[in-house]
């Protein structure tokens, strides 16, 4: 299929800058609520992250015909273009931060798709040709993933959740309460 | 200024013991976890051990399991590794490190300190 | 032997643009973060690039990383003579529980 793009928007999906989301209740832990869940307080000592919109799952929205050969779509369709990163841990959500944040390196996330929409569209062909009916599948919505094997950096397909896996049989420790208001957005967003 | 500082290197006996310090100033000590990382003469870097910021999450590189272990004290600013049974394979530099971002490397070393384990 | 592979050995001249190839396995590139170090002679190694393709502050932006299944690679360009030192990539290895460093690359600036 060829397509040919004539606008795009864009939508980010990211936690706030040193907000973090609320610890399930049952891994709260007095000792700590008052730290940042994944290795420090919020950004203030000499090695800040860098500015947060370097470091989120972006929805860029296209809208593009479909072509088929000589036809093209009567009308556009809107699809979304995952792009950006999921990184440092220190802007990702308890969701996918199961593993151990304060060590050096650890579980890779990738902004890919998460949802498809499949949508039927007719396509115009010249030379008084029937009009075709075609179904195109579209990417629904973006979410951040776990790299595994399988996944290539260039390479952002349908790939399959994996959840990070606990090290060590440990539970993960709970390092901060944040603000409640960011929770829903969150979990939805990851 | 950041500065990690390490001490208690030396020349040592294989099977004895030696205690490596490391001395944290320029930061706020508990933001960082903290980690031990050695070169060998002429080769190149090897993690030891690592440990989190309260001190109560511990890993430990397979050739010193059970023969080191790594503990802080954040009221002193202070990173230790107690290497009991020392080999001479462990002659190396042993620099202190840390890290501020969760799985964002480590940004900030010592100059390290220097164990020779010889006979 | 290194868990992670790097060549021993990189040169090129000032100005030109190296890369430094880095290969793992399933357990620490193809599912971890990768960063890298940079260690001039007879001093302490220094972050360079940390989570595949980030710059600390303070790093040129001539250094870049990037990563792709299990192996990562470290692009220098406009090398200067400054740029010689030995450099190291490293990743958490999910099956040795440890935090791996590759052998190191010495590069030599012509």
């Known amino acids: 299929q060829g397509w040919q793009a004539f606008k795009n928007d864009a939508t980010e999906i990211i936690p706030e800058l040193g907000e973090y989301p609320e610890p399930p209740p049952e891994l709260e832990n007095n000792k700590t609520m008052n730290r940042a869940e994944n290795g420090g307080r919020p950004p203030h000592h000499p090695f800040e992250t860098k500015d947060v919109s370097e470091y989120s799952c972006r929805e860029l929205h296209f809208t593009r015909y479909v072509t088929d050969g000589p036809c093209r779509s009567a009308k556009p369709v809107t699809e979304l273009v995952c792009s950006g990163q999921c990184g440092p841990a220190r802007l990702l959500p308890n969701a996918i931060g199961r593993g151990k944040w304060w060590r050096p390196s650890g579980p890779d996330f990738r902004c890919i798709p998460d949802r498809y929409r499949a949508q039927r569209v007719q396509l115009l062909c010249p030379g008084g040709e029937a009009p075709r009916a075609r179904k195109v599948r579209l990417v629904a919505s973006c979410k951040c993933k776990r790299l595994t094997r399988f996944h290539n950096q260039s390479e952002l397909k349908d790939f399959g959740t994996e959840a990070a896996r606990p090290q060590k049989g440990r539970k993960p420790r709970p390092r901060a309460r944040s603000a409640k208001a960011n929770q829903a957005e969150l979990e939805n967003a990851y | 200024e950041v500065q990690l500082v390490e001490s208690g290197g030396g020349l040592v006996q294989p099977g004895r013991s030696l205690r490596l310090s490391c001395a944290a100033s320029?930061?706020?000590?508990?933001?960082?976890?903290l980690h031990w990382v050695r070169q060998a003469p002429g080769k190149g870097l090897e993690w030891v051990s690592g440990?989190?910021?309260?001190?109560?999450?511990?890993d430990y590189a397979d050739s010193v399991k059970g023969r080191f272990t790594i503990s802080r004290d954040n009221a002193k600013n202070s990173l230790y590794l107690q290497m009991n049974s020392l080999r001479v394979e462990d002659t190396a530099l042993y620099y202190c490190?840390?890290?501020?971002?969760?799985?964002?490397?480590?940004?900030?070393w010592g100059q390290g300190t220097t164990v020779t384990v010889s006979s | 032997q290194s868990v992670l592979t790097q060549p021993p050995s990189a040169s090129g001249t000032p100005g030109q643009r190296v890369t430094i190839s880095c290969s793992g396995s399933?357990?620490?590139?193809?599912?971890?973060?990768v960063n890298w170090y940079q260690q001039l002679p007879g001093t302490a190694p220094k972050l360079l690039i940390y989570s595949n393709n980030q710059r600390p502050s303070g790093v040129p932006d001539r250094f870049s990383g990037s990563k792709s299944g299990t192996s990562a690679s470290l692009a220098i360009s406009g090398l200067q003579s400054e740029d010689e030192a030995d450099y190291y990539c490293?990743?958490?290895?999910?099956?040795?529980?440890?935090?791996?460093f590759g052998g190191g690359t010495k590069l030599t600036v012509l």
């Open positions: 490293a990743a958490w290895d999910d099956n040795l529980e440890s935090y791996v």
């Open positions: 440990i989190n910021w309260e001190g109560d999450d511990i």
């Open positions: 399933s357990s620490n590139i193809g599912r971890n973060t």
């Open positions: 490190a840390g890290n501020s971002r969760g799985y964002g490397g480590l940004d900030v």
């Open positions: 320029g930061f706020t000590f508990d933001d960082y976890a």
